[in-house]
């Protein structure tokens, strides 16, 4: 048993890190695998995470972790029964996925504007809480080609925008997504979508 | 709640031995690594020793070691530190140290030892 | 072995004072440095980790700044319960050490 693809790993910055990686050949990760995670700093004992398959071939672990900062630094041991298949190391800071936003919502009832709202994903205590920018995608559900991308730029996790930017009298959805600057992260996920229908007056014409 | 109590200090002669321990409870003693820091009389903090959680791993600061042994029994959740040889230099109030990912995050509230002719 | 030289040995403030102590380590630690306060008769007490991550229930006017060798402990407003001595210390590698101490006492 090998490894053929050695871990990879992403943190939340919050309570989770997640590492994949792949076998040589089709394995049962949770039986025949565990990944053992530890601070390098600690001679505690090891927390030990048991993988669950990812593909044929592939394993994939959720690492939970009592909270981070920037200096952590992990150990990381890949053990097949009593053989060490792979031994690295893990910088949780350098290697950040945000958590995707929530509980998007489209406020419809404000003048002919559309207030698109959502939560940030995480707690006010939280280095990355004032740090998220967001990308808020909306398109077409009868226009593949109306497709549109707004970066928000600001804290705030909100935006704004004219009804009449978009069609009128047709559906559209809303998705939202998060990175940090100052980490240098990935995009997060993109939060459930959800769906209104765009209506707004248009404006009367004068010939 | 985690509590550390340690026990075993007294006034001794240099050159001869004392064993401290401490006893441990409210959290798994088996799975943390712990240490002994200790503190002359009006001077400032030392750290002593570590062991790790199984007792396979052991240091020392240079100024002990050959002289003082750290060892653990786990089933008795307790920490020793014995101390042979002892000089006037060790006279220091002992304490024992849980670590955490702060370093040490529980300490005890200490045993004097006193080494005196 | 990392040698950690704290700056000032002592010091005599005022209460509401802005106090900054400053601790060198001998090389690179990685962020790992701790700030202790310790009261006489007492148990040491932690307040910072990992360089400038506050410890539970420790208030905000204590916070942690610095990375690589040069790291900062500030209480912004000094109150009377903080007249104590102040203890940095490495854990990026064994043996672990300690600064000398400062004492802040009340001018």
């Known amino acids: 048993m090998k490894v053929l693809q050695e871990p990879t790993c992403v943190s939340d910055y919050m309570s989770i890190s997640t590492c994949e990686w792949k076998m040589n050949g089709p394995t049962n990760c949770s039986t025949e695998l565990r990944l053992l995670y530890q601070l390098v700093f600690l001679l505690s004992e090891a927390h030990t995470c048991i993988p669950e398959n990812n593909g044929g071939a592939g394993c994939v672990c959720h690492l939970l972790m009592d909270d981070v900062v920037s200096a952590d630094n992990y150990t990381l041991d890949l053990w097949a029964g009593q053989q060490l298949l792979w031994k690295g190391s893990f910088k949780p800071s350098e290697h950040v996925k945000p958590r995707a936003p929530g509980n998007l919502t489209v406020h419809t009832n404000v003048s002919d504007t559309l207030l698109l709202t959502w939560s940030n994903p995480y707690p006010p205590d939280n280095y990355l809480y004032n740090h998220l920018t967001y990308a808020v995608n909306i398109w077409s559900e009868n226009d593949p080609a109306d497709f549109r991308i707004y970066n928000v730029t600001y804290l705030e996790p909100s935006l704004r925008i004219a009804a009449s930017t978009l069609k009128s009298g047709i559906s559209y959805r809303a998705r939202v997504r998060a990175w940090a600057q100052c980490y240098n992260t990935t995009w997060s996920e993109w939060s459930p979508s959800t769906k209104w229908h765009n209506s707004y007056r248009e404006p009367f014409e004068q010939h | 709640q985690v509590q550390l109590v340690e026990s075993g200090g007294g006034v001794v002669q240099p050159g001869r031995s004392l064993r401290l321990s401490c006893a441990a409870s409210g959290f798994t003693f088996r799975s943390y690594g712990m240490h002994w820091v200790r503190q002359a009389p009006g001077k400032g903090l030392e750290w002593v020793a570590v062991?790790?959680?199984?007792?396979?791993?052991?240091y020392y600061i240079d100024s002990v070691k050959g002289r003082f042994t750290i060892s653990r029994d786990n089933s008795k959740n307790t920490l020793n530190l014995q101390m042979n040889s002892l000089r006037l230099e060790d006279t220091a109030v002992y304490y024992c140290?849980?670590?955490?990912?702060?370093?040490?995050?529980?300490w005890g509230q200490g045993t004097l030892v006193t080494v005196s002719s | 072995d990392i040698q950690m030289t704290q700056s000032p040995s002592s010091l005599s403030a005022s209460v509401g004072d802005r106090v900054t102590i400053t601790c060198r380590a001998s090389?690179?630690?990685?962020?790992?440095l701790a700030w202790f306060q310790q009261k006489p008769g007492k148990v040491p007490k932690s307040l910072i980790h990992a360089a400038s991550s506050l410890q539970s229930g420790v208030p905000s006017k204590f916070s942690g700044s610095g990375s690589g060798t040069d790291f900062t402990l500030t209480i912004s407003s000094l109150q009377p319960e903080d007249f104590a001595t102040y203890y940095c210390?490495?854990?990026?590698?064994?043996?672990?050490?300690f600064g000398q101490g400062t004492k802040v006492e009340i001018k």
């Open positions: 140290a849980k670590e955490g990912r702060g370093g040490f995050d529980y």
């Open positions: 062991i790790s959680y199984d007792g396979s791993n052991k």
């Open positions: 090389q690179v630690i990685n962020n790992y």
């Open positions: 210390q490495q854990y990026n590698s064994h043996p672990w050490t």
